[in-house]
């Protein structure tokens, strides 16, 4: 994987990232919502990409809790039976069916806040989440297709004469790798059982005036560029070139 580098600014140019636990929410400010929600769509579905290891808050339709009869969260995760979390206002009781993940909870007491939270989102939280609100005016739904995003681990190394390998390991979805300058490249994808994908791009540069090569990894969680200085092949006879 190349020689040990003097500092972080040569072989593995790792972008500095903030790993603090972030929270994301698609909840709207209820003051901005039309009072009469029935004039809006009665059912809203949203695709929502969420970064792994962050916190997520999912919201019900903006219906005043005083008008409520029942709130139900329906959670459909891959390979698991459907989980439901229900709250009946009249009796002030909550009920859960087939819900085993302790990280998926009501944000607070459902009589105060109908939102659902996922603490420290994991790959297993990929799925469909739907809030169903039963009111005297009818049923209102809001659904989320939650797509958990996993930042790939990026490495770059030279493995043969003027050939470099860039890997974006275990990303979700698959990362896209491009090079500066463009080389003669082959890209392979490896799919893992947990839904992540490793992308490996191997490039060769025949032209000898290429000094450094940059691997640019594009991903929904953010982009990263690494570069290395191409080294002569070990054991090769010395040469002198003009540029």
């Amino acid at each position: 994987e190349g020689a040990a580098q003097p500092n972080n600014s040569l072989m593995l140019q790792t972008s500095k990232e903030n790993h603090a636990l972030a929270s994301s929410s698609l909840c709207m400010d209820e003051k901005q919502i039309t009072q009469n929600y029935s004039k809006v769509l009665a059912e809203v579905n949203t695709s929502w990409p969420v970064k792994m290891a962050t916190n997520a808050v999912l919201c019900c339709p903006p219906i005043a809790l005083r008008n409520l009869i029942i709130i139900t969260w329906e959670i459909i995760l891959r390979g698991q039976p459907s989980c439901t979390k229900a709250y009946k206002k009249e009796t002030n009781e909550t009920k859960e069916t087939n819900c085993t993940d302790e990280r998926i909870t009501w944000v607070s007491r459902p009589d105060q806040n109908s939102d659902l939270q996922i603490r420290t989102v994991a790959i297993t939280h990929d799925g469909y989440y739907r809030c169903i609100m039963v009111t005297p005016d009818g049923n209102f739904h809001r659904g989320y297709h939650l797509q958990v995003l996993v930042t790939p681990e990026v490495t770059l190394f030279q493995n043969r004469n003027r050939t470099a390998v860039c890997k974006a390991v275990a990303g979700k979805p698959a990362a896209h790798i491009s090079w500066i300058p463009e080389g003669d490249c082959a890209t392979k994808q490896e799919y893992w059982s947990n839904g992540t994908v490793t992308v490996k791009s191997t490039c060769h540069w025949e032209v000898h005036n290429v000094s450094t090569v940059t691997c640019h990894v594009s991903h929904l969680t953010g982009n990263k560029s690494l570069y290395i200085e191409l080294l002569p092949v070990p054991g090769a006879k010395k040469s002198a070139k003009l540029y």
Epitope: A4, P6, I180, L226, E229, S239
Partner: antibody, heavy 114, light 105 residues
């Protein structure tokens, strides 16, 4: 800690040759290209060439063909640049640098004067 | 050779100002940004277009891709008075921008 220590100021006559050194420490000397950069008074920076101490491969800027010669002694972790047939145009500060500009020597001032 | 056009060649700004300078390359490249003070060697600020070198204040940032690149100082400080260079290291010969001399008003 990575350090590049360059030899001191040189005063030379036109037509003469000078050889300056760059001693490296704090990293594996044979694993990185060592580049040399020229900075003339009040001017920008110009790449002279580079040497890979691991096998003494060299790359030169066409402009410095026949002017600069790069060598390295791995046992001393030291790179050298020799400038020949000096003229006033060669008066400048010369830097050695490695790891794609991460580390620089303090520079060697060469003054060519009759 | 890759031509590097750096602009402006000089600029004067007040303390606290946001300052930007640009480098334009004749080919698609990757670059580093350096700061140089009189009588001193260049100091690496930004590597690989946008990565802040260890120990460099976060008021410095780099951006761009391909042929157009920018160095930004978000809030100018006294110690930032220097000349700034870009370097393209993708192709040999390496080529530098002409430099931007930054002065404090």
């Amino acid at each position: 800690e990575v350090q590049l220590q360059q030899s001191g100021t040189v005063l030379a006559r036109p037509g003469a040759s000078v050889k300056m050194s760059c001693e490296a420490s704090g990293y594996t000397f044979t694993s990185y290209w060592m580049h040399w950069v020229k900075q003339s008074p009040g001017q920008g920076l110009e790449w002279v060439g580079a040497i890979y101490p691991g096998n003494s491969d060299t790359n030169y800027n066409q402009k410095f063909k026949g002017k600069a010669k790069l060598t390295a002694v791995t046992s001393a972790s030291t790179a050298y640049m020799e400038l020949s047939s000096l003229t006033n145009e060669d008066s400048a500060v010369y830097y050695c640098t490695t790891a794609v500009g991460s580390y620089w020597g303090q520079g060697t001032l060469v003054t060519v004067s009759a | 050779d890759v031509q590097m056009i750096q602009s402006p060649s000089s600029l004067s700004a007040s303390l606290g100002d946001k300052v930007t300078m640009t480098c334009q390359a004749s080919h698609t490249i990757n670059l580093n940004w350096f700061q140089q003070k009189p009588g001193k060697a260049p100091k690496l600020l930004i590597y690989g277009t946008s990565n802040l070198e260890d120990g460099v204040p976060p008021r410095f940032s780099g951006s761009g891709y391909g042929t157009d690149f920018t160095l930004t100082i978000s809030s100018l400080e006294d110690e930032d008075m220097a000349t700034y260079f870009c370097l393209q290291h993708t192709y040999l010969p390496w080529t530098f921008g002409g430099g931007t001399k930054l002065e404090i008003k």
